[in-house]
């Protein structure tokens, strides 16, 4: 873990302020891949390079991050400096040899819930919330903080408004929201689980 | 290394209490839930809970709630599963165990105590 | 609760034999499965976690597969020290639930 982060540091650090302005143009409307959102242009714009790669990091994930920052590297005539980040993703991530077992790619920093070491990631992606405050209702949240979520114009601000309760949940409280995700949205924690 | 040694076997009477331990060693206590099993003899495995010993918190197997209770003592990184009034049908193989790592991927099992067998009977 | 049903109860087979254990759930639990080894006076060895990864240091002629309700636990080549009790495990909510167990024994 972390080596991917930090080629595309590398990479956006090697960019002049130019480059790194049309950079982020590029970034508001690159096709993705389905089920990831796209950074807020607001945010996107004035973020400097350390801020945008941990951005990129936690919207995209380190491998696919590393992946679209190439990718708007080359849409903008950047082929070298994208080949660059590839290589340096892809040094030393070889599949392990048929028998042995690869250990896991990261582990998550000690004592950190899986919902506050993914917080803008679930924050950006997860679109059944809906849900989410229906298995959560009377256990984990108000009454008052339901409709407070609920009346939320979007996911993503729905889900930063449940964030914003959860400085006061104990381990067990996130453990059910984890659950929660698991069954409305299984794909996306075990796509989050991988990174 | 990660190590859970837990305590003793017991034989027990009917409505006595009783408290078994686990002591863990090779990591930080706080940083990892430590989940409780059972075994009554002859049957499969059944949890009963876990204990999140860096805010104290508990899940319990509605089964087990108000049966048994799960604590630690972060000063000497050690878990409890206690009983105020036990019952011939407490009478099972118990394991404390910790999961693979701490994030998603805490429901599988990769280090176990060596159990503490506990007898009720009169 | 979300049920785990095993099968067979107990099995039968030589050793250099292939052998698969099914493991049923009354509902759609994804991938969130892990199996476990137990021998008589030991505490349960994790094989297998998340349905298909083999945990570090088992042997690779174990192998899981499968995903919503059905799942399988492969020994291609039965050994000696294969012979104990099998049981699959759920992740997916709470209470966190097992198989009822597969006996592995010498035919």
């Known amino acids: 873990m972390g080596r991917a982060r930090d080629a595309i540091l590398d990479a956006l650090e090697n960019l002049t302020a130019e480059e790194l302005k049309k950079f982020k143009l590029k970034l508001l409307s690159v096709p993705l891949r389905e089920g990831y959102g796209r950074i807020p242009r607001g945010a996107l714009l004035s973020m400097d390079a350390l801020d945008l790669t941990d951005k990129l990091v936690s919207f995209y994930l380190e491998t696919y991050g590393a992946e679209l920052t190439a990718n708007v590297l080359r849409d903008m005539g950047l082929q070298e400096m994208a080949g660059q980040l590839q290589a340096a993703t892809h040094q030393g991530s070889g599949a392990a040899p048929a028998g042995i077992q690869a250990p896991p790619q990261s582990a998550a920093k000690p004592g950190l819930h899986f919902i506050d070491q993914h917080r803008a990631a679930l924050i950006a992606r997860v679109t059944n919330v809906e849900w989410l405050l229906d298995a959560l209702y009377g256990k984990v949240l108000t009454d008052e903080q339901y409709q407070a979520v609920r009346a939320e114009p979007t996911n993503p601000s729905k889900m930063r408004k449940l964030f914003s309760f959860t400085p006061a949940w104990n381990w067990t409280c996130k453990d059910l929201l984890l659950q929660a995700l698991r069954e409305s949205q299984s794909y996306l924690v075990e796509d989050l689980e991988r990174s | 290394e990660v190590q859970l040694v837990q305590s003793g076997a017991e034989v027990k009477k009917p409505g006595e209490s009783l408290k078994i331990s686990c002591k863990i060693s090779g990591y930080t206590f706080t940083d990892q839930t430590i989940h409780w099993m059972h075994q009554m003899p002859g049957k499969g495995l059944e949890w009963i809970g876990y204990i999140y010993p860096g805010d104290g918190s508990a899940m319990y197997n509605e089964k087990f709630r108000g049966q048994a209770t799960l604590s630690a003592d972060k000063s000497i990184s050690t878990a409890y599963l206690q009983w105020s009034s036990l019952k011939a049908s407490d009478t099972a193989m118990y394991f404390c165990?910790?999961?693979?790592?701490?994030?998603?991927?805490?429901?599988?099992?990769?280090?176990w105590g060596q159990g503490t067998l506990v007898t009720v009977s009169s | 609760d979300i049920q785990m049903t095993q099968s067979p109860s107990t099995l039968s087979a030589s050793v250099g034999d292939r052998v698969t254990i099914t493991c049923h759930a009354s509902?759609?639990?994804?991938?969130?499965l892990s199996w476990y080894q137990r021998k008589p006076g030991k505490a349960p060895k994790l094989l297998i976690y998340?349905?298909?990864n083999l945990h570090t240091g088992v042997p690779s002629r174990f192998s899981g597969s499968g995903s919503g309700t059905e799942f399988t636990l492969t020994i291609s080549s039965l050994q000696p020290d294969d012979f104990a009790t099998y049981y699959c495990?759920?992740?997916?909510?709470?209470?966190?639930?097992f198989g009822q167990g597969t006996k592995l024994e010498i035919k």
């Open positions: 495990q759920q992740g997916q909510s709470y209470p966190l639930t």
């Open positions: 998340k349905s298909s």
């Open positions: 165990a910790r999961p693979l790592y701490s994030y998603a991927s805490y429901y599988w099992f990769a280090y």
């Open positions: 509902q759609n639990i994804n991938v969130w």
